[in-house]
């Protein structure tokens, strides 16, 4: 039988807005990944920032509802925004426990689906918060 969906929870310092209220944090101790049990969906998400071939996690947690993409078993990120020149935000949604822990692969930033220069921008050093 299914359990309530459990996702990895992480929010990088400086990230604006929190998704902590979308679930209940489990007490996992210090050495394990933080885990959140989703309150309103059976869907996890992840956001990574790719800069000069280096990916850094920005946010991981629960989505606020089940949307297209949530049926995916794995985290397959797609490019969503350019928060600053030379960096691209990739996001994924997936619907299995801890599926947002890491991604299967990142497509190249210039691949189809990347928003053009009209995408969300952020000043250098400023983080961006995206409504998923």
């Amino acid at each position: 039988p299914p359990n309530r969906r459990t996702c990895v929870f992480f929010e990088a310092p400086g990230v604006r807005g929190s998704t902590k209220t979308l679930g209940e944090l489990l007490d996992t101790g210090t050495e394990l990944p933080r885990a959140i049990r989703c309150l309103y969906s059976r869907c996890c998400f992840g956001i990574w920032n790719l800069t000069q071939d280096r990916a850094q996690v920005e946010m991981q947690g629960c989505r606020d509802s089940d949307e297209p993409g949530c049926e995916s078993l794995h985290c397959d990120p797609s490019p969503r925004a350019h928060p600053s020149p030379g960096s691209t935000l990739f996001t994924c949604s997936c619907g299995t426990d801890f599926c947002n822990a890491n991604y299967s692969h990142l497509p190249p930033p210039g691949s189809p689906g990347t928003p053009g220069s009209q995408g969300p921008q952020a000043a250098p050093g400023e983080s961006i918060w995206m409504a998923l």
Partner: antibody, heavy 113, light 112 residues
Framework: QVQLVQSGAEVKKPGASVKVSCKAS????????VSWVRQAPGQGLEWMGE????????NFNEKFKGRVTMTTDTSTSTAYMELRSLRSDDTAVYYC??????WGQGTLVTVSS | DVVMTQSPLSLPVTLGQPASISCRSS???????????LEWYLQRPGQSPRLLIY???NRFSGVPDRFIGSGSGTDFTLKISRVEAEDVGVYYC?????????FGAGTKLEIK
């Protein structure tokens, strides 16, 4: 087919610890939570907690916090439940289950001085 | 903790006749994701519990279709359309919506 095979019966003294093992086969061990449930003699079932073998994240019944440790060894597809500071009312059959759908045969733990 | 109240505690049934077990929870078991984490188990004498129903009404694989789960919110029912000899044992309802997960006290089904 899915199978969960538990370790044999144990007799312990009050204050001691017990570690029950649960060896899984027939499925991908890291893809399912392992639940632990106990049943005192002639009584009903009591949920103790669960662990996700892929990363070791566990979720406990507060009643057992501080006394129970759940671990897994993914190389042998084995889950473990250790209960410390045993009391006579911990005498029970301890069951492991694959996310509550397939259950082990149970391990009787008797706590007696 | 969420209290699961089963009735009756003992259920004598004639072979071939229907049987019904009620389970009431002290809080709604519908979770924020829209799913109701309510399950039914049968523990035959001397055996481990066996999953019958999950998500209120979904039969687990291999469970005969004479077992029917229904209900919502705080009121749930397990019906057996025609009781067979192998159905003897203790039936437990269980909720996984709230922590800690909790079982009902059990309903002992026996043949008259």
């Amino acid at each position: 087919q899915v199978q969960l095979v538990q370790s044999g019966a144990e007799v312990k003294k009050p204050g001691a610890s017990v570690k029950v093992s649960c060896k899984a086969s027939g499925y991908t061990f890291t893809d399912y939570w392992v639940s632990w449930v106990r049943q005192a003699p002639g009584q009903g079932l009591e949920w103790m907690g669960e662990i996700y073998p892929k990363n070791g994240v566990s979720n406990f019944n507060e009643k057992f916090k501080g006394r129970v440790t759940m671990t897994t060894d993914t190389s042998t597809s084995t889950a473990y439940m250790e209960l410390r500071s045993l009391r006579s009312d911990d005498t029970a059959v301890y069951y492991c289950a694959r996310q509550r759908d397939y259950w082990g045969q149970g391990t009787l733990v008797t706590v007696s001085s | 903790d969420v209290v699961m109240t089963q009735s009756p505690l003992s259920l004598p049934v004639t072979l071939g006749q229907p049987a019904s077990i009620s389970c009431r929870s002290s809080q709604s078991l519908e979770y924020g994701d829209g799913y109701t984490y309510l399950e039914w188990y049968l523990q035959r004498p001397g055996q481990s519990p066996r999953l019958l129903i999950y998500g209120v009404s979904n039969r687990f694989s291999g469970v005969p279709d004479r077992f029917i789960g229904s209900g919502s919110g705080t009121d749930f029912t397990l019906k057996i359309s025609r009781v067979e000899a192998e159905d003897v044992g203790v039936y437990y309802c269980f909720q996984a919506t709230h922590d800690p997960n909790t079982f009902g006290a059990g309903t002992k089904l026996e043949i008259k």
